[in-house]
């Protein structure tokens, strides 16, 4: 059930077990008789077919190409081919840092706010059955934790928790010992206190429209990362198939907050769309802010003072 390798560009560290799993795996099982081939190309070599005879380090299982381990000369392009399905990866194998327990280029950075929940779990689902033991290191010093199969840290973050955490899985394969390292760079930051989210622009907007035409109602807000923005307009689903919420757009502000924009698209405007409230709401744990749009027929706009129109 391990997910396939969908990323087209992959960087790995020399000396570790590694695998590529193609993304038509379920299909491959259905067509057992179909020819399935793995190829490599690098530099002067064009499309060399791979098989266990090409290298003692390579193994092929169903949907997976395994390296035991991957080495610098494995750098190159890899292809999986089956009937008219092809998948390609570009593999870059980098040197291991011999002076550290991890390689800087293979570090995942995470920012955690002080006093917030902080968790590190050492798991590797693909090699799970082969793993003998797993150790967790902080700044290359081994942490003494109870569980040596899946060491875990779960706590409220303190500034002292900052550092490089490396999960090292030890496993045996064909009588040889291998290890796989996954490192996190944890930075602990001050509590970034939340703002009260606010919708931008007037709270009530009359929009002049023509029947049969389309309109886009744009709702913008300044909010926190975990706040949400959504449209509310009539409860019954499917009552108007011409109304669509577009994907929300978010841009981070220099202060670490978010500017969000969510568009409601109304196509082929009909009478039923006029003089009803289309509400946009931004919500947080601290409260909500709502802004309303009312569609008004252009012919009727003379009845409403000009300053209340948004277009």
């Amino acid at each position: 059930a391990e997910s396939c390798t969908s990323r087209p560009h992959i960087t790995v560290v020399e000396g570790e077990p590694f695998y590529l799993k193609h993304c038509s795996c379920s299909l491959a099982h259905e067509i057992e008789t179909t020819t399935k081939s793995w190829y490599k190309s690098s530099g002067s070599q064009e499309h060399v077919e791979l098989n266990p005879r090409s290298s003692s380090r390579i193994a092929l299982h169903d949907c997976v190409l395994e390296f035991w381990p991957v080495e610098l000369n494995d750098t190159g392009s890899y292809f999986f081919q089956m009937k008219n399905y092809t998948q390609k990866w570009k593999l870059n194998v980098i040197r291991r840092n011999k002076h550290s327990c991890f390689t800087e280029r293979q570090v995942t950075s995470k920012i955690v706010e002080v006093k917030k929940f902080f968790q590190i779990t050492c798991e590797n689902s693909y090699y799970q059955t082969l793993v003998n033991s797993t150790s967790l290191y902080k700044n290359c010093k081994k942490l003494l934790l109870e569980n040596n199969k899946n060491p875990t840290i779960k706590k409220n973050a303190e500034f002292e928790d900052q550092g490089y955490y490396s999960c090292v899985h030890f496993l045996h394969h064909n009588g040889k010992l291998f290890n796989i390292t996954k490192t996190f760079n944890i930075t602990i930051v001050e509590d970034r206190s939340n703002i009260v989210p606010v919708l931008l622009g007037p709270k009530l907007n009359h929009v002049a429209v023509e029947l049969g035409k389309n309109v886009r109602l744009n709702c913008s807000a300044l909010l926190n990362e975990e706040d949400v923005i959504y449209w509310m307009f009539g409860e019954e689903n499917g009552s108007d198939p011409n109304i669509h919420e577009e994907k929300e757009m978010r841009i981070m502000t220099p202060e670490g907050k978010w500017h969000a924009s969510k568009v409601l698209r109304i196509e082929n405007i009909g009478e039923s769309n006029l003089n009803v409230l289309y509400n946009c709401t931004v919500a947080s744990t601290g409260g909500t802010d709502t802004k309303s749009f009312i569609l008004v027929r252009k012919a009727d706009m003379a009845d409403i003072p000009g300053h209340v129109f948004t277009r």
Epitope: D227, V228, Y230, M232, E235, E236, N237, T281, A283, S284, T285, G286, G287, T288
Partner: nanobody, 114 residues
Framework: EVQLVESGGGLVQPGGSLRLSCATS???????MGWFRQGPGKHRELVAR???????YYVDSVKGRFAISRDNAKNTVYLQMNSLKPEDTAVYYC?????????WGQGTQVTVSS
């Protein structure tokens, strides 16, 4: 403090189904409730909501595949997810809609992959 506990997620193949549950420590009788999701590298979005009277609303991407329901006696909201697609992969959360949010629960991870 109100608590929301989501459950029912898991790993499922494309085309498969899951039923998520959300148990809350407050009475939901008079509340609009919704299911939100946050995909990898994305922001949290409302995908389905249900009014106190049981009227429902879904975003286009899940219409016809997801069904939200509620059991006021158990203070629980459900999301039946059918014909799942890889793009439905996300952490799913429930919360109040049209009023201040309750503190977010841990969510339940849904992974759709072959």
């Amino acid at each position: 403090e109100v608590q929301l506990v989501e459950s029912g997620g898991g790993l499922v193949q494309p085309g498969g189904s899951l039923r998520l549950s959300c148990a809350t420590s407050e009475s939901i009788f008079s509340l609009n409730m919704g299911w939100f999701r946050q995909g990898p590298g994305k922001h949290r979005e409302l995908v389905a909501r249900i009014s106190p009277a049981g009227s429902t609303y879904y975003v286009d991407s899940v219409k016809g595949r997801f069904a939200i329901s509620r059991d006021n006696a158990k203070n629980t909201v459900y999301l039946q997810m059918n014909s799942l697609k890889p793009e439905d992969t996300a952490v799913y959360y429930c919360n109040r809609v049209n009023t201040a949010l309750a503190p977010w629960g841990q969510g339940t991870q849904v992974t759709v992959s072959s």
